[in-house]
């Protein structure tokens, strides 16, 4: 049993003599009727009217009226498409003059049921100028002087110089606030490799393969270790300044205190960490008397070593 066709809902158009025909629906497959399209729309054949057929799959054409879009005149653009007709679903590139473009950095417009999307117009876009680039000891590849948003350009360093990551060439990008960076070509003999590792400590940042002169890297020590020296190292003439040392803490254990019949004064810790230079106060356990000088009960931590007082 072939499904008949209901009265066609022709968007942006209608059947000729619609009211006279409506009572005779649904109709059988094979029937056809003349229809028209509203202003700014046309039939798939490019006319303002045509025939719509009832088929086994429903009405044909499925979209009887298509939007017509005429390409407007572009201020600040190239007008090779000016006045040309495009039909719903068609897209075309918009060619704007340097420094101009479609909103949101788009490059194409599409004829939709509602008209052009986006509207073809060339607006002033964010650009970057070649004259804003300072490059010493290298070259910019491009010949243009103005670059549009998101444009990436290459630069290269002369022999004996390298980019911050040690390559012979690099790139910068035109961003909303100007160039992403200035090209860097540094003397290969002046750059540094990764900073030296230190015992019981580490750098606070992710390490790079190459550092430019005057780069600074910060170190930190593991918990309870004390940093001695500057916590920063600086790259200069291809070498890093002296890194800091991480000084061992003194670990006061219950085992050592029991051996000497002592305990921590005013604390009940079973294990206690003291930094270099810290004073640790001990006292004799109940029933024991000092066997070493009174001064020894105020022991000073020296790079992981502490001299325990003794009680007998």
């Amino acid at each position: 049993q072939v499904k008949p066709c209901d009265f066609p809902d022709i968007k942006h158009g209608g059947l000729f003599h619609e009211n006279m025909r409506r009572p005779y629906f649904p109709v059988a497959v094979g029937k056809y009727y003349s229809y028209y399209c509203d202003e700014h729309f046309e039939t798939p054949s490019g006319s303002y009217w045509d025939y719509i057929h009832c088929t086994q799959n429903g009405w044909s054409p499925a979209v009887p009226c298509l939007r017509k879009c005429y390409f407007p005149y572009l201020e600040n653009g190239y007008n090779q498409n000016y006045g040309r007709k495009f039909v719903q679903g068609n897209s075309t590139e918009v060619a704007c003059h340097p420094g101009y473009g479609l909103p949101k950095a788009q490059t194409t417009v599409t004829c939709t049921e509602k008209g052009w999307s986006p509207t073809p117009r060339c607006i002033r876009v964010r650009t970057c100028s070649k004259s804003d680039i300072e490059i010493e000891n290298g070259f910019i590849s491009e010949s243009s002087s103005i670059y549009i948003l998101n444009k990436e350009i290459q630069y290269k360093c002369k022999p004996g110089y390298a980019t911050a990551d040690g390559n012979s060439s690099g790139s910068i990008t035109c961003l909303q606030n100007g160039w992403s960076a200035q090209p860097i070509c540094i003397n290969s003999s002046e750059k540094c490799g990764p900073p030296p590792p230190i015992s019981n400590g580490d750098t606070t940042s992710f390490l790079l393969k190459v550092y430019v002169p005057q780069s600074r890297v910060e170190y930190q020590c593991q918990p309870y270790y004390e940093l001695q020296g500057s916590n920063y190292v600086t790259c200069s003439n291809g070498e890093w300044s002296e890194p800091p040392r991480c000084i061992h803490p003194c670990i006061i254990t219950e085992e050592n205190m029991n051996k000497n019949n002592i305990k921590l004064k005013g604390r009940s810790d079973r294990k206690y960490y003291a930094k270099t230079g810290d004073t640790i106060e001990f006292m004799c356990k109940l029933g024991y008397n000092a066997n070493t000088s009174i001064l020894s009960f105020q022991a000073v931590c020296r790079e992981g070593i502490v001299e325990y007082p003794r009680c007998e």
């Epitope: 290459q154 290269k156 360093c157 002369k158 060439s169």
Partner: antibody, heavy 114, light 107 residues
């Protein structure tokens, strides 16, 4: 170690086009922007022809600019030289090189003769 | 274009001699200059870059000096394998240009 190898016809007719290719092995053509062509007429000095960046940008010797095209093919890891409207004065050994690290091809002699 | 001139155009010297070749640029090229050696039938090879930096693997008897418009290549003690042609090349500005060369042969 990067190696460069020129290839192309050793004989070109006057007014014809000289076409040479430089195959890069042992490294990626995208790792440098200094892919260069130089030539040396028999018994004479060296002349810089031009260069290409891996993004396709070029710089040419103005004395040859109207006749020369240097292009890069990243998919084949090679770059090429085309010199149009050649005369006997274009007879030379043509070298391709990577200028930054100083890697050279072995050179290829191109003779312009009918 | 920047013109490069070299002197002398040729010289004869003996093994062990100190040899000096001069290169002049028609305008200031800072230190953007390289020196190349080419033996007959062989590929050129860079000896010096940035006017005075020795290319890796090049013997220390080769040295370069100068800045601006006047540059010198010196071979402190000429060896048998140094008999060749020498070219200077400026890479300060496009087009890169080379000197006409200096031929060093055996006296």
């Amino acid at each position: 170690q990067v190696q460069l190898q020129e290839s192309g016809p050793g004989l070109v007719k006057p007014s014809g086009t000289l076409s040479l290719t430089c195959a890069v092995s042992g490294g990626s053509i995208s790792s440098s922007n200094w892919w260069t062509w130089v030539r040396q007429p028999p018994g004479k000095g060296l002349e810089w022809i031009g260069e290409t960046y891996h993004d396709g940008s070029t710089n040419y010797n103005p004395s040859l600019k109207s006749r020369v095209t240097i292009s890069v093919d990243k998919s084949k890891n090679q770059f090429s030289l085309k010199l149009s409207s050649v005369t006997a004065a274009d007879t030379a050994v043509y070298y391709c090189l990577e200028f930054y690290f100083d890697y050279w091809g072995q050179g290829t002699l191109v003779t312009v003769s009918s | 274009d920047i013109q490069m001139t070299q002197s002398p155009s040729s010289l004869s010297a003996s093994v062990g001699d100190r040899v000096t070749i001069t290169c002049r640029a028609s305008q200031d090229i800072r230190n953007d200059l390289g020196w190349y050696q080419q033996k007959p039938g062989k590929v050129p090879k860079r000896l010096i870059y940035a006017a005075s930096s020795l290319q890796s693997g090049v013997p220390s008897r080769f040295s370069g000096s100068g800045s601006g418009t006047e540059f010198t290549l010196t071979i402190s003690s000429l060896q048998p394998e140094d008999f060749a042609s020498y070219y200077c090349l400026q890479y300060n500005n496009y087009p890169f240009t080379l000197g006409p060369g200096t031929k060093v042969d055996i006296k």
